[in-house]
């Protein structure tokens, strides 16, 4: 292990389309990849009239945008589908939305998903 880096070996798995894709709906996913690649967890979700609908959660492979992020946070302003990634086992259990925009009072929307 490299000092200061959280190695990701497993992530929370969720697939809203589990029936069509013929997968489990939820569980724990082991993260595989080449030895020289970093591994991350991710979450994607939608906000439908204030209700959080998780699309997918799982492992995500070597993405510089995820490096050294211990928390799963979406910073894009009002995307159609939210995405965040992080490093560390099961770091995608919770995810948040902190839009990067110039406002006087930025809002925090932490989410603890409860898959159906």
């Amino acid at each position: 292990a490299i000092l200061g880096r959280s190695e990701t070996q497993e992530c929370l798995f969720f697939n809203a389309n589990w029936e069509r894709d013929r997968t489990n709906q939820t569980g724990v996913e082991p993260c595989y990849g080449d030895k020289d690649k970093r591994r991350h967890c991710f979450a994607t979700w939608k906000n439908i009239s204030g209700s959080i609908e998780i699309v997918k959660q799982g492992c995500w492979l070597d993405d510089i945008n995820c490096y050294d992020r211990t928390d799963c946070i979406e910073k894009k302003d009002s995307p159609e589908v939210y995405f965040c990634c992080c490093e560390g086992n099961m770091c995608n259990e919770k995810f948040s939305y902190f839009p990067e925009m110039e406002v006087t009072q930025p809002t925090s929307n932490p989410v603890t998903p409860k898959p159906p």
């Epitope: 697939n15 389309n17 069509r20 894709d21 013929r22 997968t23 996913e29 993260c31 595989y32 990849g33 080449d34 690649k37 991710f42 994607t44 997918k56 799982g58 492992c59 995500w60 492979l61 993405d63 510089i64 945008n65 995307p79 159609e80 589908v81 995405f83």
Partner: antibody
Framework: EVQLLESGGGLVQPGGSLRLSCAAS????????MNWVRQAPGKGLEWVSG????????SYADSVKGRFTISRDNSKNTLYLQMNSLRAEDTAVYYC?????????????WGQGTLVTVSS | DIQMTQSPSSLSASVGDRVTITCRAS??????LNWYQQKPGKAPKLVIY???SLASGVPSRFSGSGSGTDFTLTISSLQPEDFATYYC?????????FGGGTKVEIK
Amino acid sequence: EVQLLESGGGLVQPGGSLRLSCAASGFTFSSYSMNWVRQAPGKGLEWVSGINYNGGYKSYADSVKGRFTISRDNSKNTLYLQMNSLRAEDTAVYYCARSATWHDTHLDYWGQGTLVTVSS
Amino acid sequence: DIQMTQSPSSLSASVGDRVTITCRASQSIVRYLNWYQQKPGKAPKLVIYAATSLASGVPSRFSGSGSGTDFTLTISSLQPEDFATYYCQQSYELPLTFGGGTKVEIK
């Protein structure tokens, strides 16, 4: 070095069957999802089927559903595609390709391809 | 199924040119977008994955950008070995789908 080597292609009559194989080496085959992608002559790429690392999840394009079956033998480091009820439109080069996870499906290594020709 | 539309379908360029290829998805695919390079008679080769990540062994003149529905592959200074066909591919949902390809030819 990662290597994927397809075999089993050839000329077959409409309605016939073929089984393609993809022999993998240079990586831990049992840790990776695998896919079949085809390319008709002079055309673009079409995903055919995918299977996760332990064979528990399988998925198919609508165009081959019910006719093709993907499988793997992790003890032999080999991926298979059983193709039945072949049609002229199945004529293509078939590639096997590796992906790290079932859902984050970027295909980081590809075989050289094997040509399947369906013709009477 | 998610439809992927690439433009242009072909382009002519000279060595040293900056080349941009675009790919549009029929719905948001977040960052589940990959780019491949294919030369005649050869298998495709991964160039960019997750919209912006450079694949192993790919020169830094290649870059990817975009999220949601609109994505771009840029070659900052075209080299002789870059003349090929480029495909985008979404991995947001199954079935995986590819764009129709962009052929980069020598002017």
